[in-house]
């Protein structure tokens, strides 16, 4: 092992290295000094480091560490950020197509229900989008609102087209009758089940991806402790004080230091593993009624069938509703 | 039967239902993401080793620095923390994670709980229950064609519904990502403030 530089040697090489970190040479001694004020790079003999240099080395070491951490997570961060954005947009595209399919079904099969049907369908799918993005909306309420809104228009336009333009009082009665008489059969319940399950899973999937980004961002921007900074300085820079510029830290020593510095971060590992495995389980289960693409793009067909169900039972329903909402209708005719 | 709005929106660029095999769907995209994520399953436990391998460490040199002195790479002194009197490495480990790390661990625990709840078969109303409602047709197999919608002639089959890559503005291949390959990152000159 080479002895420390003799006291008469200059610190010229150390100065030129340090200048890259800190322009201005006033902190580097001309010749090696005892270094009794040093706190991290404790010298065994004369040293080319000063207290100010040591502080700068600590700052640089912590900065290096932060940069290394960020470069380590770059690929993972990019993967999750880009996927979160792509899936969010893909889900929006599905919602848009589902809305267009449903509007097309109304336009082609029930033109007399438009444009109001477009309005109710539009509001429904707006709520679907908001729910996926985390809004506090109840899916069952959304579906109920869709059918509650559709029924008065179906009743006044398809089943009883002789009625004058629907007024609020008969509409309210018809909305109530829709649920009481189960005019759409079990279709609303079927849609509720399928939509709520597929949207719940979709929402959690997006939430999980966004949390993944948050996890990486958190560990990406960790500020390392002073103790860690001292350990890193000793590992990366203290050799400079002895004029050993080209020497590198020992591998085993580096691992010990890194484990010390990153003890807190490594605690995430267990939960991170579980996160990826749980996400995999969720993804494996995203099919049929748990797949929003499948459910939403088929909604137009189920809604069509539900209207056919109403039409099939129109005779019976008109009689019952005629009695049930008679008071509202009389008020409307006056 | 329900008019199927397949060719209604050609001018509106609505994606038509795809009848071509092997087209990319959302579900295949999700599975692809999981496969890529699984390659990062040990990300946090491997971090200390990764950082050492991407910062200047002695690999081919005979001598290396142990924090206090120059030693032979394979000597016992090489792995020892040179400044053992300065402060205790064990103490540093015992401090526990920072508050921000504790917070993120709590959030991970919560999402993991949610994910598990959603994935649990017993937590689900399975398709079987819907069959009892009498709305699903019996001729719907478990092949890649999915049953959509209600009964009778309103039923349509949709194969590999949407091709999202065609419509999304950006490609998802991480191969083009900046700094994507952990292996290829240059070690010694990666961080500008290292001067070795």
């Amino acid at each position: 092992q080479p002895p420390p530089p003799p006291p008469d040697a200059t610190c010229h090489q150390v100065r030129s290295f340090f200048q890259r970190l800190q322009p201005g040479l006033k902190w580097v001694p001309e010749t090696p000094v005892p270094g009794s004020d040093l706190q991290v790079c404790l010298p065994k003999g004369p040293t080319c480091c000063s207290r100010k240099m040591e502080e700068k080395y600590q700052l640089t070491a912590r900065l290096n560490m932060e940069q290394l951490l960020q470069s380590a997570s770059m690929e993972l961060k990019f993967l999750i950020i880009q996927n979160a954005a792509v899936f969010q947009e893909a889900f929006e595209i599905v919602v848009r197509h589902a809305k267009n399919y449903t509007n097309a079904m109304f336009k082609n099969n029930y033109p007399s229900l438009t444009p109001q049907a477009f309005e109710f369908v539009g509001e429904f799918f707006t709520d679907v989008s908001l729910y996926i993005l985390g809004s506090d909306i109840n899916v069952d309420d959304m579906v109920n609102e869709l059918f509650d809104s559709l029924f008065p228009v179906i009743y006044t336009q398809l089943m009883n087209p002789g009625l004058p333009d629907s007024a609020l009082d008969i509409n309210e009665c018809l909305r109530g009758a829709r649920r009481d008489l189960k005019v759409f059969g079990n279709f609303p319940k079927l849609i509720m089940t399928q939509v709520s399950k597929s949207l719940q899973v979709t929402r959690i999937f997006l939430q999980a991806l966004n949390l993944g980004i948050e996890v990486i961002n958190t560990t990406d921007h960790l500020k390392f402790s002073k103790d860690c900074g001292r350990m890193l300085t000793r590992m990366w820079y203290c050799s400079y004080c002895q004029g050993l510029m080209m020497v590198k830290p020992c591998g085993g020593y580096c691992n010990v230091v890194m484990q010390g510095c990153m003890a807190g971060v490594v605690e995430i590992d267990k939960y991170w593993r579980e996160y990826i495995l749980s996400l995999e389980e969720l993804v494996n289960g995203m099919y049929r009624i748990y797949d929003m693409e499948n459910v939403l793009l088929g909604l137009f067909s189920t809604i069509h069938d539900s209207i056919q169900y109403v039409q099939k039972n129109a005779g019976k329903l008109t009689t019952t509703i005629g009695k049930l909402c008679a008071h509202s209708q009389q008020r409307q005719y006056r | 039967s329900a008019y199927y709005p397949e060719d209604l929106f050609i001018d509106k660029k609505v994606l038509k239902v795809a009848h071509v095999e092997h087209e990319e769907t959302l579900s295949s995209r999700r599975r692809e993401l999981i496969q890529k994520l699984k390659s990062f399953i040990s990300f946090y436990s491997a971090l200390p080793g990764y950082i050492c391998s991407h910062s200047p460490v002695a690999e081919n040199d005979t001598l290396c620095w142990n924090g206090q002195e120059l030693v032979e790479r394979y000597s016992q002194k090489a792995a020892r923390n040179g400044m053992k009197n300065q402060f205790n490495l064990h103490e540093l480990k015992m401090k526990g994670p920072e508050p921000v790390v504790s917070q993120i661990i709590d959030k991970l625990k919560h999402i993991n709980q949610l994910l598990r709840t959603m994935s649990m078969p017993k937590g689900r109303v399975l398709d079987k229950n819907l069959d009892e409602e009498g709305f699903e047709s019996g001729d719907c197999g478990d092949d890649e064609d999915e049953c959509i919608g209600g009964s009778g002639d309103g039923m349509i089959k949709v194969k590999n519904q949407l091709r999202f890559l065609a419509e999304l503005a950006y490609d998802l291949d991480v191969d083009d990502a900046p700094g994507n390959s952990q292996q290829a990152t240059p070690k010694d000159n990666e961080i500008s403030t290292f001067h070795n």
Epitope: A85, Q88, E89, E92, I93, V95, R96, N103, T114, P115, Q116, F118, E119, V121, G122, E123, T126, S129, L130, L133, E145, S149, P152, D165, S166, L168, N171 | K12, K13
Partner: antibody
């Protein structure tokens, strides 16, 4: 001809009230969602409020919430905006606009009515 | 709320020239984007809906494109009556918001 005609604008003091009306013709008013959109002098467009055809959904911009009330009378083909606690920054041309859900756009606009809030 | 940023603020062109107006959303709006034209003292008029579809009666020289966060309105060959202010508007999320406008003026 599809038409929307606003009325009721004028000069009012800060803290005062005003009621705007919009008369619709040429389409089935009771089937469409309606909105108020405003434009301050020399500035851009700002959505103010939305009401569904059956009045079951009503939405407001944060800037007017609690001060403005949107309503409609389908029997009279009319849309209203009751504006209370008016502020200087409410000075604008107020447009009545039909929302077409199939297009996801404001497809029909009135010519606007000027509201000036000044002491 | 989603912020729409239009650029440029002013576009000085001559009749017959091609005008390209840009609208950028602060987050994805899918294709829920419309374009309006407004002339001095007049109400806005719908030009394009769903990012790329021309409204009834709008000449073919007007075209829209884009999806997600970046959208473009193109007027292939400016006519004298096209000099006006153009606004983009999103409906992906409530509230519906408008861009600050791009003024297309005669050079």
């Amino acid at each position: 001809e599809v038409q929307l005609v606003e009325s009721g604008g004028g000069l009012v003091q800060p803290g005062g009230s005003l009621r705007l009306s919009c008369a619709a013709s040429g389409f089935t008013f009771s089937s469409y969602s309606m909105n108020w959109v405003r434009q301050a002098p020399g500035k851009g467009l700002e959505w103010v409020s939305y009401i569904r055809s059956d009045s079951r959904t009503i939405k407001y911009a944060d800037s007017v919430k609690g001060r403005f009330t949107i309503s409609r009378d389908n029997a009279k083909n009319s849309l209203f905006l009751q504006m209370n606690s008016l502020r200087d920054e409410d000075t604008a041309v107020y447009y009545c606009a039909r929302w077409e859900w199939e297009l996801d756009a404001f497809d029909i606009w009135g010519q606007g009515t000027m509201v000036t809030v000044s002491s | 709320e989603i912020v729409l940023t239009q650029s440029p603020a002013t576009l000085s062109l001559s009749p017959g020239e091609r005008a390209t107006l840009s609208c950028r959303a602060s987050q994805s709006v899918s294709s829920y984007l419309a374009w309006y034209q407004q002339k001095p003292g007049q109400a806005p008029r719908l030009l394009i809906y769903d990012a790329s579809n021309r409204a009834t009666g709008i000449p073919a020289r007007f075209s829209g494109s884009g999806s997600g966060t970046d959208f473009t309105l193109t007027i292939s060959s400016l006519e004298p009556e096209d000099f006006a202010v153009y606004y983009c508007q999103q409906r992906s999320n409530w509230p519906p918001t408008f861009g600050q406008g791009t003024k297309v003026e005669i050079k």
